[in-house]
């Protein structure tokens, strides 16, 4: 008999190559039963997770399996990171595994930035 | 220096489809994003859709049946065509850049905008 | 869909006022624009990101707010400020615009 828990399948290690400037959709792949859980995105932050709050999330229902998407429109470099999706159900927590983002800047690839421009804006050093 | 010019019939008639163009110049359509907006007389702004970088795009749900945005990145041209055009659809239609900094996305630079009446 | 309510709908000032537009959103967003449109021109960007000055911009302009609730401040109105001026978010598709805010002189 399947088990009815809720699962979150996340590979362990998972992570996405991106580009700054596209959208990207993050797939969260849910497994559930009867009732469809809750699921909450958050990006970490050192030990802790950050719910993401004002974010742009989605389902998208498939035969054996649904998926929770977090929206990126477009990608920024400050969405480089770790992140994870929990899902509470019948008041138990479930985690996932976190998937890591990488992004890389496309106008800084391109325009070669100057020093000073470097000194004032780091991130451009992502990738 | 960046420009984005909108070009395309002044009049169309009800049920006809609209076909605008962007022209842009000091940038690449490869590494900005396009959108369209657009402003009936006296009213307020109205995103309609975008033409990402990659090739991708996204639209304004209430308008997605209606809209098709193409782009030819080597004519640096970006193309909106609305279908089933109708005189609430009458406006100041304007394409604009898309740009990112590290946290946040905005349009921050606006073609003149070309008005297109719709009327039999 | 963010519904974006601007108030006052019409703000009669004089040259030289302090002026305070208001922008609330129906859901939380990250950050909000603020553009400025003058008759018979393209809306040009004024503040980025709730409090970031577009290039040009003079310093007299101001931003802040966070959550549903955001403000664009002129603290010493010049005449070349009176404009229609339109809140902008860029949280959730459809990316939607406040109706607008008259600034005219009094």
């Known amino acids: 008999k399947e088990s009815c828990d809720v699962q979150l399948y996340i590979k362990r290690q998972s992570e996405h190559s991106i580009l700054a400037g596209d959208p990207f959709e993050l797939e969260c792949p849910v497994k559930y039963c009867a009732n469809r859980p809750h699921v909450t995105w958050c990006k970490l932050n050192g030990t802790t997770c950050v719910k993401l709050e004002d974010r742009q999330t989605s389902w998208k229902e498939e035969k054996n399996i649904s998926f929770f998407i977090l929206h990126f429109e477009p990608v920024l470099p400050n969405d480089n990171g770790s992140y994870r999706c929990s899902a509470n159900f019948q008041s138990n927590l479930i985690e996932s595994h976190s998937t890591t983002l990488y992004v890389t800047d496309v106008k800084s690839a391109s325009e070669r930035p100057s020093k000073d421009e470097m000194a004032s804006r780091p991130w451009l050093l992502y990738r | 220096q960046v420009t984005l010019k909108e070009s395309g019939p002044a009049l169309v008639k009800p049920t006809q489809t609209l076909t605008l163009t962007c022209t842009v110049s000091?940038?690449?359509?490869?590494?900005?994003?396009v959108h369209w907006i657009r402003q009936p007389p006296g009213k307020a702004l109205e995103w309609l859709g975008v033409?990402?970088?990659?090739?991708?795009?996204s639209y304004n749900p209430s308008l997605k049946s209606r809209l098709t945005i193409t782009k030819d990145n080597s004519k640096s041209q970006v193309v909106l065509t609305m279908t089933n055009m109708d005189p609430v659809d009458t406006a100041t239609y304007y394409c604009v850049r898309g740009d990112y900094e590290y946290d946040y996305y905005a349009m921050d630079y606006w073609g003149q905008g070309t008005l297109v009446t719709v009327s039999s | 869909e963010i519904v974006l309510t601007q108030s006052p709908a019409t703000l009669s000032l004089s040259p030289g006022e302090r002026a305070t537009l208001s922008c609330r959103a129906s859901?939380?967003?990250?950050?909000m624009h603020w553009y400025q449109q003058k008759p018979g021109q393209a809306p040009r960007p004024l503040i980025y990101?709730?409090?970031n000055r577009a290039t040009g911009i003079p310093a007299r302009f101001s931003g802040s707010g966070s959550g549903t609730d955001y403000t664009l401040t002129i603290s010493s109105l010049e005449p070349e400020d009176f404009a229609v001026y339109y809140c902008?978010?860029?949280?959730?598709?459809?990316?939607?615009f406040g109706q607008g805010t008259k600034l005219e002189i009094k």
């Open positions: 902008h978010q860029w949280s959730s598709n459809p990316y939607t």
């Open positions: 859901s939380s967003v990250s950050y």
């Open positions: 033409m990402w970088p990659g090739g991708r795009t």
């Open positions: 990101a709730t409090s």
């Open positions: 000091g940038f690449s359509l490869t590494t900005y994003g």
